[in-house]
């Protein structure tokens, strides 16, 4: 069975084809080759000499036991080599020779027992080394690591490392890899020698499910003393063994580290006193809790010095009390409990993401809700009922506003967005908004992107509601049950580039409303019920138009519509997916491609 | 279509068939077997994925005695610092994991429950596997 040609001459997918040897019938120019799940078993020297241009080679689960010297010789452009799931028993010293451009090496689950005799010391370009899920017992980074000056990611998770000694990291003292991210999760750690990480600098250190007791966790974290780390991730996994006990003593050792960003990811334990618990983390710039349960929500009003707080997928008794002077960014998403939003006091806040919480807002939105006048980004999407009772007074700095899939109330009672002259992006898609007031978008003079799909209009008619949106470049009006539109609805949108009118209910196509859209490049009218054109002769769309989508409509392919069908043919160079433009009527032409029709009509009156 | 038996409990019998062409082997054990009136146990899965499990989610299509419920989407792996360790599993890496589950207080009517589980993962998104579970429920008490 042949390989699948994904991109001609470039990408070939040969997965699970029962190949016992490397195929020789693929082009020399192949850059991406997936040979995974084939029983190759043995790689001799110059195995891939037919593919000198290879950049990505996937050899996952190929039952490879032996890799000889120079197996990859000639692959001087290879940047990614994947060897996941091969039971390697014999790895020659020169197995990886010739890989002068290799940036990513994945040797997950390959029976690797030690880094010491892993022959990669010459791979100077290596950025990512993933040796997770192996049998490595020693964390000693071999001397050859001093050659790997570009290394940014080292994944040693799911190995057998129990202890870390001062000598293990000596090579990092000699040549500090300032950008190294290290993942040691799921190693059964019980000892880190104090001083082992002294004066070591890491970009990221991840330690999840490493400790089988509170005491071990405590002493190991104390062993990290002296480490300077940009981002530290601690925590557990839901499907692994979890700590029986967890208290403030666990994290006391963090006072002896220099940490820029901290994240606690999943803990099967109720956090009650976060002030004491995170006492050593009051001055990190970014603090993040993922999938934890928080009992006392008042604690977030303590004077933490965080600039970014992230609470994701957590459980709360009620919406937390948030009073944080220095906070600039708050991400509070996908949390449970506390369904009613309560005011927060965050005077420095610029970025607020409150999406996907099922929250309801009694009144939205003004400065008093968030305790700030600096807000630039506000995401309230995928929540509950949001009642619009104020038009963003004190929030005039807003540039990005997202309400999609929340239930907006009172949207047509006043000009909700009147204050937002700096707003660039607005998404009110699927918000149960019924447009019944022409001033709905008044004030939005800087708006560039407006997404309002999945809403409705009074009498299914699009009125002149965009008159002030002179900078708009993107407008999505799909799924709005629209049937008619004002001939001047788009007259002021001379900068508009993309207009999505798909999935509405237009019976006919009219070019007249688009005559002023001098910048229009994409017009999507797919999934309507267009049968014909409006009575007048169709004009040309703006000359800027490059893509016109008329697929999945109800074209009536009869003589009376001959001029419309001819007009469609004349637009051929603009049309996308023409094969999905089919006749719906009459029955003998149903399913026929509109462009293949040869309509010769004797118009016998 | 070959049917794979999972287990029997006092009020349910559970089996599954593949609903995709690939039919890559997957081993599923539930201990103790699910009782629909109340249950707590461990789900054990052994599987070698044909693509990375990053951003794994399930589409669930549930049918109760021929009545279709709305499609549900269950996100399992968000893509960074996920709850489950198997979210970092790569294509070709053995996934051998045990997940605890518990639910209580749901009353199910007697009959045949079908649940099509479409597992989608990776970027770009593609189907990882598709299984159709059949649960025959025979309430032994009210």
């Amino acid at each position: 069975e042949p390989c699948v040609e994904v991109v001609p001459n470039i990408t070939y997918q040969c997965m699970e084809l029962n190949f016992y040897k490397i195929p020789d019938n693929l082009p020399f120019s192949t850059k991406n080759l997936d040979l995974s799940f084939n029983p190759l078993r043995h790689l001799g020297s110059y195995s891939f000499f037919s593919f000198p241009e290879l950049q990505v080679l996937d050899l996952s689960r190929c039952e490879i036991q032996t890799i000889e010297d120079g197996a990859y010789q000639s692959l001087s452009h290879l940047s990614t080599l994947i060897l996941t799931g091969n039971p390697i028993q014999s790895l020659a010293l020169g197995a990886f020779s010739g890989l002068s451009s290799l940036q990513k090496l994945v040797a997950v689950e390959t029976n690797l027992a030690s880094l010491e005799n892993f022959p990669i010391g010459h791979l100077k370009t290596l950025k990512e080394l993933n040796v997770a899920h192996n049998l490595i017992q020693s964390f000693k980074l071999p001397e050859y690591f001093s050659n790997l000056t570009n290394l940014e990611h080292l994944d040693l998770s799911s190995n057998k490392i129990q202890s870390i000694y001062c000598t293990d990291l000596r090579v990092l003292h000699q040549m500090p890899l300032l950008n190294l991210s290290l993942d040691l999760s799921l190693n059964p750690m019980n000892f880190i020698q104090p001083g082992a990480f002294k004066e070591i600098r890491l970009h990221k250190l991840t330690l999840r499910n490493n400790f089988d007791s509170l005491n071990v966790m405590k002493t190991c974290i104390q062993g990290l003393a002296g480490l300077e780390v940009h981002r530290l991730v601690l925590g557990e996994f839901r499907n692994e063994g979890n700590l029986e006990k967890f208290d403030k003593s666990a994290l006391e050792g963090l006072c002896n580290l220099t940490i820029e960003e901290f994240r606690l990811a999943y803990l099967d334990y109720y956090l009650d006193d976060i002030i004491d618990l995170f006492n050593c983390l009051t001055n990190v710039s970014s603090f993040s809790l993922v999938s934890v349960t928080i009992e006392r929500v008042k604690d977030f009003s303590y004077n933490f010095g965080w600039q970014h707080l992230e609470l994701v997928n957590c459980k709360f008794g009620q919406f937390p009390t948030l009073k944080l002077k220095s906070l600039k960014r708050l991400t509070f998403t996908s949390n449970k409990g506390g369904n009613a939003f309560s005011e927060v006091d965050l005077p420095s806040l610029e970025f607020l993401d409150l999406s996907r919480n099922g929250l309801s807002f009694k009144g939205c939105c003004s400065q008093s809700d968030f305790g700030t006048t600096s807000l630039k980004y506000l995401d309230l999407s995928f929540n509950g009922v949001i009642t619009m009772s104020s038009n963003f007074l004190g929030l005039e700095q807003l540039e990005h506003l997202d309400f999609q899939h929340s239930n907006l109330k009172q949207m047509s009672e006043f000009s909700v967005f009147l204050s937002l002259r700096n707003l660039i992006y607005l998404d009110i898609s699927h918000t149960h908004t019924r447009v019944a007031f022409n001033g709905i978008f008044n004030g939005l003079s800087s708006l560039e992107v407006l997404k309002m799909a999945g809403n409705s209009f009074q009498e299914n008619f699009l009125p002149d509601i965009f008159t002030e949106l002179r900078n708009l470049t993107f407008l999505d009006l799909s799924q709005c049950q629209l049937e008619q539109l004002s001939p001047t609805a788009f007259n002021s949108l001379s900068s508009l580039q993309v207009l999505n009118m798909s999935h509405n209910n237009f019976f006919s196509l009219d070019t007249f409303p688009y005559k002023c859209l001098n910048s229009l490049q994409v017009l999507d009218y797919s999934l309507n019920h267009i049968m014909t054109s409006k009575k007048q002769e169709l004009q040309h769309f703006p000359s800027s138009l490059a893509f016109l989508n008329l697929t999945q409509n109800d074209f009536a392919c009869t003589c009376e519509h001959q001029s419309f069908l001819q007009w469609i043919k004349d637009q051929r160079q603009l049309l996308v997916e023409v094969e999905r433009m089919e006749c719906a009527t009459p029955s003998d032409k149903q399913g026929m491609p509109v462009l293949s029709l040869n309509i010769t009509c004797q118009m016998n009156k | 279509q070959k049917q794979y038996w999972v287990c029997n409990s006092s009020d349910a019998s559970i089996s599954y068939t593949y609903c995709d062409k690939m039919q890559y082997p997957i081993s599923i054990n539930v201990n103790p077997c699910i009782e629909l009136k109340r249950s707590k146990g461990l789900l054990h899965i052994f599987y070698i994925p044909r693509r990375d499990l990053k951003q794994l989610y399930f589409n669930l299509y549930i049918t109760v005695n021929t009545m279709n419920l709305p499609k549900r989407k269950e996100v399992i792996c968000r893509g960074s610092d996920d709850d489950y360790s198997f979210c970092r599993a790569l294509k070709g890496e053995t996934v051998n994991t045990t997940i605890s589950f518990s639910f209580k207080g749901i009353k199910f009517s007697k009959g045949k429950y079908k649940c099509v589980v479409e597992a989608i993962s990776g970027s770009p998104e593609e189907m990882l596997f598709c299984l159709e579970f059949v649960i025959l429920h025979q309430p032994n008490s009210n």
């Epitope: 299914n460 008619f461 209910n505 237009f506 019976f507 999934l527 019920h529 109800d554 719906a584 | -």
Partner: nanobody, 119 residues
Framework: EVQLVESGGGLVQAGGSLRLSCVAS????????MGWFRQAPGKERDIVAR????????YYAESVRGRFTISRDNAKNTMYLQMNNLRPEDTAVYYC????????????WGQGTQVTVSS
């Protein structure tokens, strides 16, 4: 399952009038487009008229424009076709049609009602 039942067909003289009705059951069709198709002996089935759920939009084939009027009463789940000034060439079986969920066109069909116009 949606069922469409037409009525009102019959024999009429040229120049006369008929009013066809179509009653929908099994689901409220108030938001869906509905329409009338016809098929004359030896001819293809083709659209005559169509109306949107809100009645805002209508479409007529050129041959019936000005003579036929399509309307609907969503409260009664019923659609009508008022046919005036009938001609012999209007003789056909008239079918009631409704769109389906997700905007699927011409999803549901009635059994048809015969209209015969004699000269």
């Amino acid at each position: 399952e949606v069922q469409l039942v037409e009525s009102g067909g019959g024999l009429v003289q040229a120049g006369g009038s008929l009013r066809l009705s179509c009653v929908a059951s099994g689901r409220t069709l108030s938001t869906y487009n509905m329409g009338w198709f016809r098929q004359a002996p030896g001819k293809e089935r083709d659209i005559v008229a169509r109306i949107s759920g809100s009645s805002v939009s209508t479409y007529y084939a050129e041959s019936v424009r000005g003579r036929f009027t399509i309307s609907r009463d969503n409260a009664k789940n019923t659609m009508y076709l008022q046919m005036n000034n009938l001609r012999p060439e209007d003789t056909a079986v008239y079918y009631c049609v409704a769109d389906g969920p997700g905007g699927r066109s011409y999803e549901y069909w009635g059994q048809g009602t015969q209209v015969t116009v004699s000269s």
